[in-house]
């Protein structure tokens, strides 16, 4: 079974700088990626980010910068401009629409206790989601 | 509603420019990509490029390189696209549309009826 | 470029019939596919998207199919309305391509 993992990362060096990263774990190829911040894509959430494996990225405030990582992940760099750090709180989802599979989607955040540097393991959380 | 208005028709001589304009209503302008695409009469529909509204970021159709310019106002939420060295058969209707993330065309213009004649 | 192919460029039918538009792309694209109904004189319609979504407020007879190379626009029943040129739409790369339609008209 497809699953989608999501890891929350604090910048070591900028408290400020959060990266969100995402993996598909399945077969087929990816032809879309929503990433979405407050809840899944749809269903409450923000989105921050589409990827798309040909056509390029679009990306909205917060996002800084959403990449590639590999041809089944994606990283999206945010700017936190507030002082409070509301994304420490926040829950990201990814959703990754893998060819001919279907939609799978996985949600995450950083943990409570996360010291700058340290991220969540790369696990599926349980908010997971197949169209 | 979300709506796209473009400008008026355009009666222009081969070798001269034409820009037109399509103006966004009902959402925020910035957060979704404007495409260009044009119908020659009784011919079917060919894509030009897009227009990032948002860092004003431009993709082209190798065809139009060299001979197109798409910018945007974000204070009036209007996005341009202007053609130079026109040709006879640059006559066309010239559309934008607004780009559902990668997912095509959701919204479009009414369509600007551009006529290159001598 | 993708090359898509569209068929048939015309046909006739009659309200009520069952019909479908076919479209082949040179290469695989999987589901980046839209469909697009557009009236004389109007702006293209999304009624289709990543092949076999149905656009809001597009009725339930319209649907799509297929993935990698065959598509599919069916209309369960044609209704008086529908008589228009249906065009598809590669999304899969840069630059997007359209196939050359097909003008749905009266029997």
């Known amino acids: 079974t497809p699953e989608v993992w999501v890891q929350v990362q604090m910048e070591a060096t900028e408290l400020s700088s959060f990266t969100v990263h995402c993996g598909f774990l399945g077969p087929g190829s990816i032809s879309l990626v929503t990433v979405s911040w407050g809840g899944p894509d749809g269903a409450g959430g923000t989105k921050l980010a589409v990827l798309h494996p040909e056509l390029g990225t679009r990306q909205w405030a917060p996002a800084r910068q959403a990449r590639w990582e590999t041809q089944s992940s994606i990283s999206l760099a945010l700017e936190d401009s507030g002082a409070s750090s509301p994304f420490a709180n926040t829950t990201f989802c990814c959703k990754f629409a893998s060819f001919p599979e279907g939609s799978w989607e996985s949600c995450g955040s950083l943990p409570p206790s996360s010291d700058p540097g340290l991220s969540a393991p790369p696990t599926p959380v349980p908010i997971l989601r197949a169209d | 509603q979300v709506q796209l208005v473009q400008s008026g028709a355009e009666v222009k001589k081969p070798g001269a420019s034409v820009k037109v304009s399509c103006q966004a209503s009902g959402y925020t302008f910035t957060d979704y990509y404007i495409y260009w695409v044009r119908q020659a009469p009784g011919q079917g529909l060919e894509w030009m490029g897009w227009?990032?509204?948002?860092?004003?970021?431009?993709n082209y159709a190798q065809k139009f390189q060299g001979r197109v310019t798409m910018t945007r106002d974000t204070s009036i939420s209007t996005a341009y696209i202007e053609l130079s060295r026109l040709r006879s058969d640059d006559t066309a209707v010239y559309y934008c549309?607004?780009?559902?993330?990668?997912?095509?065309?959701?919204?479009w213009g009414q369509g600007t009826t551009v006529t290159v004649s001598s | 470029d993708i090359q898509m192919t569209q068929s048939p460029s015309s046909l006739s039918a009659s309200v009520g019939d069952r019909v479908t538009i076919t479209c082949r792309a040179s290469?695989?694209?999987?589901?980046?596919l839209g469909w697009y109904q557009q009236k004389p004189g109007k702006a293209p319609k999304r009624l289709i998207y990543a092949a076999s979504s149905l656009q809001s407020g597009v009725p339930s007879r319209f649907s799509g199919s297929g993935s990698g190379t065959e598509f599919t626009l069916t209309i369960s029943s044609l209704q008086p309305e529908d008589f228009a040129t249906y065009y598809c739409?590669?999304?899969?790369?840069?630059?997007?391509?359209f196939g050359g339609g097909t003008k749905v008209e009266i029997k």
């Open positions: 227009i990032n509204p948002n860092s004003g970021g431009t």
């Open positions: 739409l590669q999304l899969n790369s840069y630059p997007l391509t």
């Open positions: 549309a607004r780009e559902d993330n990668f997912n095509g065309m959701d919204v």
């Open positions: 290469q695989g694209i999987r589901n980046d």
